[in-house]
């Protein structure tokens, strides 16, 4: 089901945002332009009419680390990512729409410029719908292409 998100969502108070790293990419693609906050990402998505890709991850998670490497090294992924507003988060937001089936990491959620969470764009694991592993990189690429087909085109 598609869910419309509020652009005024606040950061989770219990997991407040850490100090900004030297680069907002956090290793997911140093040549790409990354937004700093969820609010900024929603605003840019709406105003630029580009879909938003949100990567939830943790520095000390082996699966986040592994996915990050293949994501950053895959030329097709990196090229396609240029067509998105990009955000990677190492903390949870209070917007429950970004964790439809739990706060596991890594997970990747797409948001349409209409501010609708693309809950229909899922990975291959029934118990963690938005999880991707290094072996799923082709599926992630396909899902990025799906997300680029916007729900409604702005005039």
């Amino acid at each position: 089901k598609d869910i419309t998100v509020k652009s005024g969502a606040k950061k989770d108070t219990k997991d407040s945002a850490p100090k900004l790293p030297q680069t907002l990419s956090r290793g997911w693609g140093d040549q790409l332009i990354w937004t700093q906050t969820y609010e900024e990402a929603l605003y840019k998505s709406k105003t630029s009419n580009k879909p938003l890709m949100i990567i939830h991850h943790l520095d000390e998670c082996p699966h986040s680390q592994a996915l990050k490497k293949v994501f950053a090294e895959n030329k097709e992924i990196q090229k396609l990512a240029e067509q998105f507003v990009l955000l990677n988060l190492v903390y949870e937001t209070t917007d429950k729409h970004l964790s439809p089936d739990g706060q596991y990491v890594p997970r990747i959620i797409f948001v349409d410029p209409s501010l609708t969470v693309r809950a229909d764009i899922t990975g291959r694991y029934s118990n963690r719908l938005y999880a991707y592993e290094p072996s799923d990189i082709a599926l992630l690429l396909d899902n990025m292409k799906k997300a680029l087909k916007l729900l409604k085109t702005e005039l």
């Epitope: 998670c61 699966h63 490497k69 118990n127 290094p134 072996s135």
Partner: antibody, heavy 120, light 107 residues
Framework: QVQLLESGGGLVKPGGSLRLSCATS????????MNWIRQAPGQGLEWIGW????????NYNGKVKDRFTLSADKAKNSVYLQMNSLRAEDTAVYFC?????????????WGQGTLVTVSS | EIVLTQSPDFQSVTPKEKVTITCKAS??????LSWFQQKPDQSPKTLIY???RLVDGVPSRFSGSGSGQDFTLTINSLEAEDAATYYC?????????FGGGTKVEIK
Amino acid sequence: QVQLLESGGGLVKPGGSLRLSCATSGYVFSRSWMNWIRQAPGQGLEWIGWIYPGDGDTNYNGKVKDRFTLSADKAKNSVYLQMNSLRAEDTAVYFCARGGYDGSPWLSYWGQGTLVTVSS
Amino acid sequence: EIVLTQSPDFQSVTPKEKVTITCKASQDINSYLSWFQQKPDQSPKTLIYRANRLVDGVPSRFSGSGSGQDFTLTINSLEAEDAATYYCLQYDEFPFTFGGGTKVEIK
């Protein structure tokens, strides 16, 4: 064919240092995680840490973090385990083990191991 | 750290018999569990990864199942060459941890 070959083991006195090597061949070295695992005589297996040769990112078991350091040399397709301030309890066979071919964390191939004995 | 408890510690089995080894994790590890076989004076060999995926070249008599906290390695019709110690490993969280091992002996 994937091959991992450890070397550098031997007898060392307590407080001493040793550098183990793991020479690899048969796959794209920079794109698979490399783990080090040890096995004390007659005991089970203990994970030491891993390194991503592509950029040198590492993670360690907290038990050895202050004394052991992982590194990689892309030109030589080799990874290294530098062990300092060695103790008797570090006596073990040390294995390198490659992660999944696709960059996944699971351990797919193991070297034959090299024995490190810490004794005075 | 995540603790993996393997059982039994030791199993003496006749050829062609079915062998079942269990591995219980102290917390949910999703399906991030591997199984290894180690023969005396040899390095471990990977049999199963992601709980149930068989590594290329491993005989089909080996199979893995489970998710969450409870996992099983099954050897469907034991052969003499399967005499070894079997270990489970969780790679869901740092530090990766191994079970204590199960020694399988041929009667």
